[in-house]
Amino acid sequence: MMTGTIETTGNISAEKGGSIILQCHLSSTTAQVTQVNWEQQDQLLAICNADLGWHISPSFKDRVAPGPGLGLTLQSLTVNDTGEYFCIYHTYPDGTYTGRIFLEVLESSVAEHGARFQIP
C-alpha cells in the first residue's frame, strides 16, 4: 500500500532572467527512493538515480543544474519556462509518486510592480 505523500513548493513565480529552485519532498513512507525524474509538460529535464547520480537532458544542460538535494535549479529563466513541472519519485517497494509545481515566469517590471495588476 502506498502511504507516502509528496510535498512540493506548489505554485511559484520568478523573474525573467533569474533562477528558481524546484523542490519536492517524499514523506510518510519508508520506501527506498531509487530514482527521481523531473519533467516539464512532455519533456524530460533531468534524472537523479540512486546508483548513477544525475543525468541532465542535453537540450537543457545550459540552463538546468542538479540540486540542491533531489531538487532542480532552473537558470536564465524565460517566459517560455512558465508551466507545469513534475517530480516523479520511483520507489521500492511502493512504486511511483508524482508531485506537481506550477512556475510562472514574470517580466522584470511585472515582478517589481505586480501590484498594478490587482483590482483595487
Epitope: E39, D42, L44, N49, S59
Partner: antibody, heavy 118, light 107 residues
Framework: EVQLLESGGGLVQPGGSLRLSCAAS????????MSWVRQAPGKGLEWVSA????????YYADSVKGRFTISRDNSKNTLYLQMNSLRAEDTAVYYC???????????WGQGTLVTVSS | DIQMTQSPSSLSASVGDRVTITCRAS??????LNWYQQKPGKAPKLLIY???SLQSGVPSRFSGSGSGTDFTLTISSLQPEDFATYYC?????????FGGGTKVEIK
C-alpha cells in the same frame, strides 16, 4: 570499454529449458538495470524482460511471464535468463542490453540464437 | 500495453537525401521515446534517447523530435552507412514496446 557477451543459446526441443548468460565488463554492473530483447528470424525487436541493478525488481513481457526468469549475480557481473517450457515461437536471437536510468538501452551484446524445434 | 506504430515500413532514398521516419504511440509517453539503428546480422545501436537527446558518438546528422504521442527521427543527409533498419521504442512503462521498424534502402 563496455562489453556484453551472451552465451547459452542452441537447439532445444519444445517444452525444454535453456539458460542464457550475459557476461558484462567495462562498467559498474550493479549500478545498472539490464534487459533481454529478442528478435525472431526476419522480424522486429521484442522486449522480453528487465531487472533492476540490485535484482530486487523484475519485469516481464506477457508472452514469457511464468516461463522465463531473469536474474543477475552482481559478484560475477553476469545476467541470466532461465527459459522453461520453450515453444517454437520463442525461436529468436536473444540480446542482453544495459539500461541506464531504467529507460533507454545504450549498449547491446552481439546476441545468441535460440532455436526451438523438434 | 502501449502500441508503437512506425511509418513508413520501408523507404528508398539516395545518398544526400533528407530522411524522416515517424513513430506514434497509442497513448502519451511524454518524451520516453528512443531510436535504434540495426544493420543485418548486427545488434541494435542506440541513436537517440528521451526523444531528442543524441547518444554519445552518434553523428549529428541524426536528430529526434516530438513529445506526447508523435515522434520523428530525421537523417539530415543520408550517408552510405545509414542504410539499415530503424526502430523506435517507448520506455514510459512496462512492457517496453518497439515499433515495427523502418527499412531504409538504396534507391
Amino acid at each position: 570499454e563496455v562489453q556484453l557477451l551472451e552465451s547459452g543459446g542452441g537447439l532445444v526441443q519444445p517444452g525444454g529449458s535453456l539458460r542464457l548468460s550475459c557476461a558484462a565488463s567495462g562498467f559498474t554492473f550493479s549500478s545498472y538495470a539490464m534487459s533481454w530483447v529478442r528478435q525472431a528470424p526476419g522480424k522486429g525487436l521484442e522486449w522480453v524482460s528487465a531487472i533492476s541493478g540490485s535484482g530486487g525488481s523484475t519485469y516481464y513481457a506477457d508472452s514469457v511471464k511464468g516461463r522465463f526468469t531473469i536474474s543477475r549475480d552482481n559478484s560475477k557481473n553476469t545476467l541470466y535468463l532461465q527459459m522453461n517450457s520453450l515453444r517454437a515461437e520463442d525461436t529468436a536471437v536473444y540480446y542482453c542490453a544495459r539500461v541506464p536510468y531504467g529507460y533507454w538501452m545504450d549498449y547491446w551484446g552481439q546476441g545468441t540464437l535460440v532455436t526451438v524445434s523438434s | 500495453d502501449i502500441q508503437m506504430t512506425q511509418s513508413p515500413s520501408s523507404l528508398s532514398a539516395s545518398v544526400g537525401d533528407r530522411v524522416t521516419i515517424t513513430c506514434r504511440a497509442s497513448q502519451s509517453i511524454s518524451s520516453y521515446l528512443n531510436w535504434y539503428q540495426q544493420k543485418p546480422g548486427k545488434a541494435p545501436k542506440l541513436l537517440i534517447y528521451a526523444a531528442s537527446s543524441l547518444q554519445s558518438g552518434v553523428p549529428s546528422r541524426f536528430s529526434g523530435s516530438g513529445s506526447g504521442t508523435d515522434f520523428t527521427l530525421t537523417i539530415s543527409s543520408l550517408q552510405p552507412e545509414d542504410f539499415a533498419t530503424y526502430y523506435c521504442q517507448q520506455s514510459y512503462s512496462t512492457p517496453l514496446t518497439f515499433g515495427g521498424g523502418t527499412k531504409v534502402e538504396i534507391k
